[in-house]
């Protein structure tokens, strides 16, 4: 008889799931030398333990310290970019700009980016056909602790002037409840992180105005500030150009604003 | 054609309030672009009080309507809205409506009310 | 706020003659994005202004090609190369570089 399964909100585990962890592991081992020690079926390992036989709305930060261990990583100061609701454009600069890195340019980041997880208490399946809703189910589910593990590390490593990119296209540019506004924001260090600067992306119709000026703009300086950690904005008018620019920086029309 | 629509002529005592609406008969691109509030007094020129993206709700205002004016806008019956409080004499003047064109220009403009503050 | 200043405050042409408006703005217009929002409107007597020239010197759809502006920074004109009697109204420039937005006093164009 099929054994009962628990039904919840969200879509279940990415198909291949395992094949797919594993495989970027390899493959980032390969491109990243510094890397090359890592022992990719540990990798898998320490993940799989992390939320395997576990109730998938019981996940604690503890459960991802051996992967956090194993996966290890420094960014060298002024070059770690972090980015809210704006993930693709985030991810083309640093193609672009490669001496910058997001969170998903890390191993742990890399191995996880949009995949879906979970398992069941007390089986060793993983769950292909449901995982727990961040809002409908549960928060303490193994994607959404997995991202706040990695991202407060990721915060917590950071050094020097911080970028982070934000969509000026949102209602809320910057939004206390996304995982930078909750979770990034509070766990840079002021001994560490002289500044943030806020890059706010508008959208892909010509504006004039200054999105730095938002209220919630505002209130991500304020929190900033009272960390004693400098804060300073810019406008990205156009964010087609200014990856253009990236790319060409000495073409002629980059003199001109972006 | 009328592209903007507002409402008509208002007349209102000292210390009240009014709303203004101004409906848009584009209403692809009402929600995506933005929507400014002019107002026009005899001797004074123009005055630019505030400016609503409609789909979001992003407000700009200009500092000296702060707190005289409320922007608002409804994406299903494509409405932007103008509320002022506290009237006086000094408010009495025609209010414009006008959408973008291309970003940050003023291309379509609505008819104008005209409000009156008298006691 | 950026002050917007118009010349002449009044202008008496004759029909099929050319009219040039100037207007000087307190502070440049040159927005960091590179484009310098700089605009020109018509308001007929009982009308809603309409917009003639966008971005210094583009002319808005509809526009007949009498109207050209031209500027640069601070310095900004429109010019009418021959007036016709339905041109007759006031002129205003507007400046969308820096919030909030301001207008001209406006200009009248009126015949001689």
């Known amino acids: 008889l099929p054994r009962w399964r628990q039904q919840w909100s969200g879509s279940g585990t990415t198909s291949r799931f395992p094949e797919t962890v594993l495989a970027r592991c390899v493959k980032y081992t390969e491109v990243h030398p510094e890397m090359r020690h890592v022992d990719c079926q540990s990798v898998w390992d320490a993940f799989k333990g992390a939320f395997i036989s576990k109730y998938p709305c019981n996940i604690t930060e503890e459960d991802y310290q051996p992967l956090v261990k194993l996966g290890t990583q420094t960014v060298p100061c002024n070059k770690t970019l972090l980015w809210s609701r704006i993930k693709d454009l985030a991810h083309q600069f640093t193609q672009v700009q490669r001496d910058m890195f997001t969170l998903e340019d890390m191993l742990l980041g890399y191995l996880a980016d949009d995949l879906t997880w979970c398992g069941e208490f007390n089986t060793f399946e993983i769950n292909y056909q449901s995982c727990p809703d961040w809002r409908k189910d549960c928060s303490n589910n193994p994607v959404s602790v997995f991202w706040k593990t990695v991202s407060r590390r990721f915060a917590e490593t950071a050094c020097g002037v911080v970028h982070v990119m934000l969509n000026g296209s949102r209602s809320k540019i910057f939004d206390k409840n996304s995982t930078f506004g909750s979770v990034e924001v509070h766990n840079l260090q002021p001994e560490k992180v002289q500044a943030l600067e806020a890059w706010v992306i508008h959208g892909g119709r010509e504006d004039s105005r200054d999105l730095c000026q938002d209220p919630t703009i505002k209130e991500l300086e304020s929190i900033i500030s009272k960390r004693n950690i400098r804060f300073f904005c810019k406008n990205i008018y156009r964010p087609d150009k200014f990856l253009q620019c990236v790319k060409n920086p000495e073409d002629s029309s980059c003199l001109s604003g972006i | 054609q009328v592209q903007l629509q507002q409402s008509v002529s208002e007349l209102r005592s000292p210390g009240s309030s009014v709303k203004l609406s101004c409906k848009d008969f584009?209403?692809?691109?009402?929600?995506?672009?933005?929507m400014s509030w002019v107002r026009q007094k005899p001797g004074h020129g123009f005055e630019w009080i505030g400016d609503?993206?409609?789909?979001?709700?992003?407000?700009f205002y200009g500092e000296k309507f702060e707190d005289k004016a409320k922007l608002d806008a409804d994406t299903v019956s494509n409405t932007a809205y103008l509320e002022l409080t506290s009237l006086s004499s000094e408010d009495s003047a025609i209010y414009y409506c006008?959408?973008?064109?291309?970003?940050?220009?003023?291309?379509?403009w609505g008819q104008g009310t005209l409000v009156a503050v008298s006691a | 706020d950026i002050v917007m200043t118009q010349t002449p405050l009044s202008l008496p042409v004759g029909l099929g003659d050319q009219a040039s408006i100037s207007c000087r703005s307190s502070?440049?217009?040159?927005?960091?994005?590179?484009?310098?929002?700089l605009h020109w409107y018509l308001q007929k007597p009982g009308q809603s202004p309409k917009l003639l020239i966008y971005?210094?010197?583009n002319r808005f759809s509809g526009v007949p090609d009498r109207f050209s502006g031209s500027g640069s920074g601070t310095d900004f004109t429109l010019k009418i190369s021959r007036v016709e009697a339905e041109d007759l109204g006031v002129y205003f420039c507007?400046?969308?570089?820096?919030?909030?937005?301001?207008f001209g006093g406006g200009t009248k164009l009126e015949i001689k």
């Open positions: 502070q440049s217009l040159l927005h960091s994005n590179g484009n310098t929002y």
């Open positions: 584009d209403s692809e691109v009402f929600p995506t672009s933005y």
């Open positions: 609503i993206l409609p789909n979001i709700g992003r407000i």
């Open positions: 507007s400046q969308s570089s820096h919030l909030p937005w301001t």
């Open positions: 971005k210094v010197s």
């Open positions: 006008a959408r973008e064109a291309y970003g940050s220009i003023l291309g379509y």
